[in-house]
Interface confidence: low
């Protein structure tokens, strides 16, 4: 029997990835640095399918349903050229609410649709965050 890889304590496993949900308030870049500090090649999480989004949303809803959460999607050139910080392809999209723009160049999972959809926000906002690595 193939054994499932184990995740760091407090992290959860889904389809070959480990996820850590941190209820600390960090701006986007500090959140990314903190994810990296946990090692294992961790970054702010990329979300690449509806299945992955649903699993994450279900997990987080067990803790809270009101605070948005940083994910690893950002627009570093501030020209709506969104990219995942871990280098994943930006193909799956789940934007909600009003379309992106203004000074909002970092993406969060939005609490007003049970974390299934994303909003853009100002990167200096301090919020909870989600990290991800492949064990």
């Amino acid at each position: 029997q193939i054994q499932r890889p184990s995740c760091a304590p407090g992290w959860f496993y889904h389809k070959s990835n480990c996820y850590g949900y941190f209820r600390k308030l960090r701006n986007w870049s500090d959140a990314e640095l903190e994810c990296q500090s946990y090692g294992n090649g961790a970054h702010l999480a990329s979300i690449l399918s509806l299945k992955e989004a649903s699993t994450i949303a279900e997990y987080i809803s067990g803790y809270q349903r009101s605070q948005p959460i940083w994910i690893g999607l950002h627009d570093p050139q501030k020209r709506q050229q969104w990219q995942w910080i871990d280098g994943a392809m930006y193909l799956y999209r789940s934007w909600s609410g009003k379309s992106m723009g203004g000074n909002k160049h970092c993406a969060e999972m939005s609490s007003n649709n049970n974390f299934l959809t994303w909003s853009s926000n100002e990167c200096n906002k301090r919020q909870h965050f989600l990290c991800k690595y492949r064990p």
């Epitope: 020209r79 930006y90 934007w95 009003k98 379309s99 203004g102 909002k104």
Partner: antibody, heavy 121, light 107 residues
Framework: EIQLQQSGTELVRPGALVKLSCKAS????????INWLKQRPEQGLEWIGW????????VFDPKFQDKAILTADTSSNTVCLQLSSLTSEDTSVYYC??????????????WGQGTLVTVSA | DIQLTQSPASLSVSVGETVTITCRAS??????FAWYQQTQGKSPQLLVH???SLADGVPSRFSGSGSGTQYFLRIDSLQSEDLGIYYC?????????FGGGTKLEIK
């Protein structure tokens, strides 16, 4: 019902400036990005830029950066486009439009009726 | 900036026929793409968003297809009210750009 009512036709002198308005009804402008577009006579459409009325952030096509100023007044639910140093090249119909959310692919789902600006001595 | 090349520039078609308009993007725009119709003296009207989804109230004889850099608008069983100019537009990044338009005339 979402509506965008634009101000009336303008005849202006070269070198002058003009301010066009777009009054929204049926929705709060803070909930959308308000875009402006240009259409020269018998020609295609050009995107000028957008404003986020929630915080007055703007994004422009670089070629309009020095020509256009976008402002928003949330109390009257109105957005304005100011065009400066007008030349005959600015003679066009100008439209305001709102982008839908990402379920709509971010497309321009609602448009104003357009304002004709004619620049002539 | 992303260029959109639309073809044909114009076409003349009889009522009841099928029309296909093509729009080619200079790079992959991942279906961040829309089609509009503009009739004489009116504002453009959204027909298709997300490359394939019909906007509210648009007749089912209109359909969008394509992906990557190549997109198509098809009009089946053309009606006289379909005359006008059709534009494609991308939303992949700013500045948003439009195709040059396709003028559709009824024979």
């Amino acid at each position: 019902e979402i509506q965008l009512q634009q101000s009336g036709t303008e005849l202006v002198r070269p070198g002058a400036l003009v301010k066009l308005s777009c009054k929204a009804s049926g929705f709060n402008i803070r909930d959308y990005y308000i875009n402006w577009l240009k259409q020269r006579p018998e020609q295609g459409l050009e995107w000028i830029g957008w404003i986020d009325p929630e915080n007055d952030d703007t994004v422009f096509d670089p070629k309009f950066q020095d020509k256009a100023i976008l402002t928003a007044d949330t109390s009257s639910n109105t957005v304005c486009l100011q065009l400066s140093s007008l030349t005959s090249e600015d003679t066009s119909v100008y439209y305001c439009a709102i982008k839908g959310n990402y379920y709509d692919g971010g497309a321009f789902a609602n448009w104003g009726q357009g304002t004709l600006v004619t620049v002539s001595a | 900036d992303i260029q959109l090349t639309q073809s044909p520039a114009s076409l003349s078609v009889s009522v009841g026929e099928t029309v296909t308009i093509t729009c080619r993007a200079s790079e992959n725009i991942y279906s961040n793409f829309a089609w509009y119709q503009q009739t004489q003296g009116k504002s453009p009207q959204l027909l298709v968003h997300g490359a394939t989804s019909l906007a509210d109230g648009v007749p089912s004889r209109f359909s969008g297809s394509g992906s990557g850099t190549q997109y198509f608008l098809r009009i089946d069983s053309l009606q006289s009210e379909d005359l006008g100019i059709y534009y494609c537009q991308h939303f992949w990044n700013t500045p948003y750009t439009f195709g040059g338009g396709t003028k559709l005339e009824i024979k």
